[in-house]
Amino acid sequence: EDELQVIQPEKSVSVAAGESATLRCAMTSLIPVGPIMWFRGAGAGRELIYNQKEGHFPRVTTVSELTKRNNLDFSISISNITPADAGTYYCVKFRKGSPDDVEFKSGAGTELSVRAKPS
């Protein structure tokens, strides 16, 4: 069985302020089991954008239906983009762990740039 890969096909995405940004991410396997999370930035200071397990992320919607048992698409859409949202977004697969899940593999990242709202 091939080891899971995290695929973020776009290196960069450009969106006008006020619009929605779609950030694509796909897994090549369902194993190991564990949640998907999206972060802006890398390292200790990274910002959690979406956690499959829990939390309320009012600006984030998933593109696919994550409750499908065979779902491999973890793309997200972020609404009402502002210049403050610019940055590099990483789709990260965690494997289950106790007491804390363990980061397993990260996508290469997608850089989001924000264009000025057309006048």
Epitope: L30, P35, E54, E65, T67, R69, S98
Partner: antibody
Framework: DVQLVESGGGVVRPGESLRLSCAAS????????MSWVRQAPGKGLEWLAG????????YYIDSVKGRFTISRDNSKSSLYLRMNSLTAEDTAVYYC???????????WGLGTLVTVSS | ALTQPASVSANPGETVKITCSGG??????YAWYQQKSPGSAPVTVI????ERPSDIPSRFSGSASGSAATLIITGVRVEDEAVYFC???????????FGAGTTLTVL
Amino acid sequence: DVQLVESGGGVVRPGESLRLSCAASGFTFSSHAMSWVRQAPGKGLEWLAGISAGGSDTYYIDSVKGRFTISRDNSKSSLYLRMNSLTAEDTAVYYCARETWNHLFDYWGLGTLVTVSS
Amino acid sequence: ALTQPASVSANPGETVKITCSGGDYYSTYYAWYQQKSPGSAPVTVIHSDDERPSDIPSRFSGSASGSAATLIITGVRVEDEAVYFCGGYDGRTYINTFGAGTTLTVL
């Protein structure tokens, strides 16, 4: 508070059909996958079928595939189980259960008893 | 199939451990369901290996390692008498399974 209330159970003869319902309240029904689980008298729990939040994907244990059909109506916050060609072995309490993000169960209904007897 | 002991007994205040084996660690999540009488509604005491619902007392905890999961009740009480079913979800097969149940008797 999350509430799941099953209905539609009763006594039927072998070979007959039955449709069970589960009315959900206290949560956003359309955001959760759901399942049916049964318990035969004096036996353990047996998962039967699951359905994704939008209803497009369904999953079954092999022993009921082709005979049982799980469905849902998100506009009514209701889950259903259509059971055909019932046999005595289908006699059980049938529970609906809400799924967690990883397809385990966090809330259960009180159950409805199905008795298949001639 | 998930395997668990048929019965366990303990005195009030003792720590009880119930094990459940048979799942592959990398593809299986475990849960524990409490049923106080046959045919009554099960109550989820642990899901996702070690997550406790907010309305479940803190004396219930769970863990998983290798091919087994464990339910731990620290300071067991008389009202914890019940049958405890372990349950698993296998991400390879998309199937939920249950153990046969463990009857906990508090002496």
